[in-house]
């Protein structure tokens, strides 16, 4: 793989997902991302933020919740909530704009 | 390695919804690590961002077409879509699926040439 | 909306030459997410350069990048005739994304 470029001081994180290549991982910011799939219960995914910060100011909708923070594991002990399920004309975006 | 590929018709009628569809192989759209973009190019033109989606289905697009623009994600098929609606010959281009990570739109879709024309 | 510049339009040089690719943004953008792409007619866009300076997997090492804050330079040591095409300047990493006008490399 190429290397990363660099990105200023890196926070550890707590990583968990499918995706993780160890129960850490280091980034610009610490992650928790709450998806609910159509049909299936939601799952909370943590790791580490290096692209798109404006993600994380988008407001939860009843699929997704993001949430970030900056210091040494800090998204070890978050739990997330979705929205309650909405009427369709209510339906928040998950445009994050 | 990860190839994507673009899918939908070629020709689309003017007033009608543009619809395209990037399957990504050799590679999870799952993963944190990446964003998947929309890229578009008109013939002789330069290149124009349209909008990126995260696996967690969370969306940005170019403010200059964000009323007309979705993008979707299915994780389970590996694919995200593209619908542009209310098209016009000017949306008459080229249209590009990129994977985007700290290194950049790092793999492209071949492209596919879309034209707008009753 | 970050504003790339990218100078000159087009540049004709030789074989063997130096060429001098320049990219100004309206505002300040991270090195660490600036990028330079080549593309060739009836191809799509190949990623040349990523964090200003770091060169993707496979690009030759003639090509390089430097700059910071708003001026950004992609300088091709010397030219081979497969890197006559058109450059773009890239800013990513946060929206909206923006692309350079791009800048066209001829052969004189």
């Known amino acids: 793989d190429p290397v990363k470029p660099s990105r200023g001081p890196l926070v550890t994180c707590t990583c968990e997902s499918p995706h993780c290549r160890g129960p850490t991982c280091q980034g610009a910011w610490c992650t928790v991302v709450l998806v609910r799939e159509e049909g299936r219960h939601p799952q909370e995914h943590r790791g580490c933020g290096n692209l798109h910060r404006e993600l994380c100011r988008g407001r939860p909708t009843e699929f997704v919740n993001h949430y970030c923070c900056d210091s040494h594991l800090c998204n070890r002990n978050v739990s997330l909530v979705l929205e309650a399920t909405q009427t369709p004309s209510e339906q928040p975006g998950t445009d994050s704009q | 390695q990860v190839q994507l590929q673009e899918s939908g018709p070629g020709l689309v009628k003017p007033s009608q919804t543009l619809s395209l569809t990037c399957t990504v192989s050799?590679?999870?759209?799952?993963?944190?690590?990446?964003?998947w973009n929309w890229i578009r190019q008109h013939p002789g033109k330069g290149l124009e961002w349209i909008g990126y989606?995260?696996?967690?289905?969370?969306?940005y697009y170019n403010p200059s077409l964000k009323s007309r623009v979705t993008i979707s994600v299915d994780t389970s098929k590996n694919q995200f879509s593209l619908k542009l609606s209310s098209v016009t010959a000017a949306d008459t281009a080229v249209y590009y699926c990129?994977?985007?990570?700290?290194?950049?739109?790092?793999?492209w879709g071949q492209g596919t040439l879309v034209t707008v024309s009753s | 909306e970050i504003v790339l510049t990218q100078s000159p339009g087009t540049l004709s040089l030789s074989p063997g030459e130096r060429a001098t690719l320049s990219c100004r943004a309206s505002q300040s953008v991270s090195s660490s997410y600036l990028a330079w792409y080549q593309q060739k007619p009836g191809q799509a866009p190949r990623l040349l350069i990523y964090?200003?300076?770091s060169r993707a997997t496979g690009i030759p090492d003639r090509f390089s990048g430097s700059g910071s804050g708003t001026d950004f330079t992609l300088t091709i040591s010397r030219l081979e005739p497969e890197d006559f095409a058109v450059y773009y300047c890239q800013q990513y990493g946060s929206s909206p994304i923006t692309f350079g006008q791009g800048t066209r490399l001829e052969i004189k």
């Open positions: 989606i995260y696996y967690s289905g969370s969306t």
């Open positions: 050799g590679g999870s759209i799952s993963s944190g690590e990446y964003y």
């Open positions: 990129a994977r985007e990570s700290v290194a950049g739109f790092d793999y």
């Open positions: 964090g200003t300076s």
